[in-house]
């Protein structure tokens, strides 16, 4: 089945120091290689989440993705800030012979907008 | 440290079943998915089954789908693989292993041997 | 299924290439697990082509190209002495695969 990496939702909006879900589906696990989220393009991309082991605080996957057929690499940001604020970008990579791995497909993005928390 | 601890193995006939454990210690036990691999006497390593984190799905190699069940209990730190209708070619050295994001291992435990003589 | 040569040999210091082959790259990674004797627990030294656990010396390194996949020891030392075991996962097929083994000696 033919790649494709589709973020649903355009953008989302989250009070302060709220959780929010950013959501991430693919249609194909081929070629093997990580799934990471990032905010923002370029080099200067901050990476977020890797499905790859690692701890990232205040971020974790939103299904089991240790099952061998999962699809789902959508993700929670807990007690968001301003800070979080931004465009995040779901993305595939092909494993390289060596590193680093071949970005092969993004999603569409999902811009985060941080509200102020209600007084 | 990562410790993984297999119990359960031993001497039974043919057509038996045993249940074999595998104690987890010293990371987040439920954040991993776990397998089961042996080695026959003289044999290189094979891989049975393997279980996701959560524990919703299964894997199996097709010479031991319907004869043995692999699963495992997070809040105890345990996996299990119920083991039936056991044959002579069933007699090896069971491990269990912890699996890597993309389902290679990276520990292992010393295995539990299980013998299978009428 | 994976191919591995049944033997290998070298003088310590030397360095060693074992070769593994038969899986597919676009849809299979490769791990390293070495046994020191039947039956004794297995270690993995190199895991998803090229990573090296944290507690296993540098002389190990692992690359992947094509269809195979090679376990580089640099500067072999009699320790090394084991049977090494490639292993593959296939993204394909869901299944875990292992060569028949490689046997080291240090002369």
């Known amino acids: 089945k033919e790649l494709k990496v589709t973020q649903p939702e355009k953008s989302v909006s989250v009070a302060a120091g709220d959780s929010t879900v950013l959501n991430c589906t693919l249609t194909s696990l081929l070629p093997v290689g990580p799934i990471k989220w990032y905010r923002g393009v370029g080099q200067s991309r901050l990476l977020i989440y890797s499905f790859t082991g690692e701890h990232f605080p205040r971020v974790t996957n939103v299904s089991d993705a240790t099952k061998r057929n999962n699809m789902d690499f959508s993700i929670r940001i807990s007690n968001v800030t301003p800070e979080d604020a931004g465009t995040y970008y779901c993305v595939k990579f092909q494993k390289g012979p060596s590193e680093p791995d071949t970005e092969i497909q993004s999603g569409g993005g999902t811009e985060v907008y941080v509200l102020a928390k209600p007084s | 440290d990562v410790q993984l601890v297999e119990s359960g193995g031993g001497v039974v006939r043919p057509g038996e079943s045993l249940r074999l454990s595998c104690a987890a210690s010293?990371?987040?036990?439920?954040?991993?998915?776990m397998s089961w691999v042996r080695q026959a006497p003289g044999k290189g390593l094979e891989w049975l089954a393997g279980?996701?984190?959560?524990?919703?799905?299964?894997y199996y190699i097709d010479s031991v789908k319907g004869r043995f069940t692999i699963s495992r209990d997070n809040p105890k730190n345990s996996l299990y693989l119920q083991m039936s209708s056991l044959t002579a070619e069933d007699t090896a050295v069971y491990y269990c292993?912890?699996?890597?994001?993309?389902?290679?291992?990276?520990?292992w435990g010393l295995g539990t041997l299980v013998t299978v003589s009428s | 299924a994976l191919t591995q040569p049944a033997s290998v040999s070298a003088n310590p210091g030397e360095t060693v290439k074992i070769t593994c082959s038969g899986g597919?790259?676009?849809?299979?990674?490769y791990a390293w697990y070495q046994q020191k004797s039947p039956g004794s627990a297995p270690v993995t030294v190199i895991h998803s082509d090229d990573k090296r656990p944290s507690d296993i010396p540098s002389r190990f390194s692992g690359s992947a190209s094509g269809s195979a996949a090679t376990l580089i020891i640099t500067g072999v030392r009699v320790e090394d002495e084991a049977v090494y075991y490639c292993?593959?996962?296939?993204?394909?097929?869901?299944?875990?695969?292992f060569g028949a083994g490689t046997t080291l000696t240090v002369l």
């Open positions: 292993a912890r699996e890597t994001w993309n389902h290679l291992f990276d520990y």
């Open positions: 279980i996701s984190a959560g524990g919703s799905d299964t």
């Open positions: 597919d790259y676009y849809s299979t990674y």
């Open positions: 292993g593959g996962y296939d993204g394909r097929t869901y299944i875990n695969t």
């Open positions: 010293g990371f987040t036990f439920s954040s991993y998915a």
